[in-house]
Interface confidence: low
Amino acid sequence: AGSDSLYVPCAPSPCVNGGTCRQTGDFTFECNCLPGFEGSTCERNIDDCPNHRCQNGGVCVDGVNTYNCRCPPQWTGQFCTEDVDECLLQPNACQNGGTCANRNGGYGCVCVNGWSGDDCSENIDDCAFASCTPGSTCIDRVASFSCMCPEGKAGLLCHLDDACISNPCHKGALCDTNPLNGQYICTCPQGYKGADCTEDVDEGNSHHHHHH
């Protein structure tokens, strides 16, 4: 056979990934691999992840002769050991006026009155602790509640009898109930005055309010 058909172990080099070929015999060779590779032709990237020091739930990502930690959002650093200050990163981490407090591995919100939840986004149901009179409807508000009274009832908690029920205001006057004491308030039409809007007005003074 001609010389061009002779097998030369290192020509071309069978070593990959930057490995250096060394002829060890007429038909044998040895690859000296770069750090991070192994195998007879340096074909395998060594899995460095078993050598990990990823802390706090970090996930190891293999590289060439090294590894990195993919950290959960609340941790940072090469090995996920450094606490992320969520309060700096997310100025709006706490809603509705809540105050952000950084903690190791997370953060907490100190909510203002009327709000709750991890990020203070939940309006506290004040109706759960309200004392609206049975038969009335409670409406939740921020840090408060209001009672919607059925016909015939009045007051903040609907615990008073509605004085307007007996139509005490005359001459087409508007009747309103004082929510504090249940008494009626007449708003008189033009030309009338008095607690019940029964008195004529000399001059054209309009819309007199009278409480009773």
Partner: antibody, heavy 117, light 112 residues
Framework: EVQLVQSGAEVKKPGESLKISCKGS????????IHWVRQMPGKGPEWTGY????????KFNEKFKGQATISVDKSITTAYLQWSSLKASDTAMYYC??????????WGQGTLVTVSS | DIVMTQSPDSLAVSLGERATINCRSS???????????LHWYQQKPGQPPKLLIY???NRFSGVPDRFSGSGSGTDFTLTISSLQAEDVAVYYC?????????FGGGTKVEIK
């Protein structure tokens, strides 16, 4: 071949300072954590702390925090464990170990530190 | 810290017989990455500990196949299937799932 070679045995008096060394070879020194493990006479090993040679970052067992410092000289692939003021209770065998498989794979031969007045 | 409890403290076994060492952790050693970082070491007098088994059941290079590891969660076992004279040593388990890494108290294996 991965090797960790530690400095020789030391006999010191309480209050003295000491720096022991651990030289790594046969691997890329910067890519692996170096640990220090203490073993008191007749007791089991205790993990003391580690150093990340690439960044110089250290992490300690709370039990040993403030008692010793760990440092590294990448140029000579050597890690150190150092005390500024030794106590009798520091008497122990100290091993350096290289990270591997999530454990301590390769160990130095150990440095015996004896603190006695 | 995670407490690693080994049993028994010492064990005397006839040559060629099976030796079993147990290690229990105070909480699960399953890491969030799915691995369980529980390892076994052998230490002979005047020598550093030597890694035998890593991550429950993987024999480290050069370790004879008479050494095997098993277990999951919080309970783990090192088995020497046929004790040899050179196996006389103290055996330690180590967890490195949780910070800080903690060793068991050790089990001394002797020949009966």
């Amino acid at each position: 071949e991965v090797q960790l070679v530690q400095s020789g045995a030391e006999v010191k008096k309480p209050g003295e300072s000491l720096k022991i060394s651990c030289k790594g070879s046969g691997y890329t020194f910067s890519n692996y954590v170096i640990h220090w493990v203490r073993q008191m006479p007749g007791k089991g090993p205790e993990w003391t702390g580690y150093i990340i040679p690439g960044s110089g970052g250290t992490k300690f067992n709370e039990k040993f925090k403030g008692q010793a410092t760990i440092s590294v000289d990448k140029s000579i692939t050597t890690a150190y464990l150092q005390w500024s003021s030794l106590k009798a209770s520091d008497t122990a065998m100290y091993y350096c170990a290289r990270d591997g498989a999530g454990s301590f794979t390769y160990w130095g031969q150990g440095t015996l530190v004896t603190v006695s007045s | 810290d995670i407490v690693m409890t080994q049993s028994p403290d010492s064990l005397a076994v006839s040559l060629g017989e099976r030796a079993t060492i147990n290690c229990r952790s105070s909480q699960s050693l399953v890491h969030s990455d799915g691995n369980t970082y529980l390892h076994w070491y052998q230490q002979k007098p005047g020598q550093p500990p030597k890694l035998l088994i890593y991550r429950i059941s993987n024999r480290f290079s050069g370790v004879p196949d008479r050494f095997s590891g098993s277990g999951s969660g919080t309970d783990f076992t090192l088995t020497i299937s046929s004790l040899q004279a050179e196996d006389v040593a103290v055996y330690y388990c180590l967890q490195s799932t949780h910070f800080p890494d903690t060793f068991g108290g050790g089990t001394k294996v002797e020949i009966k």
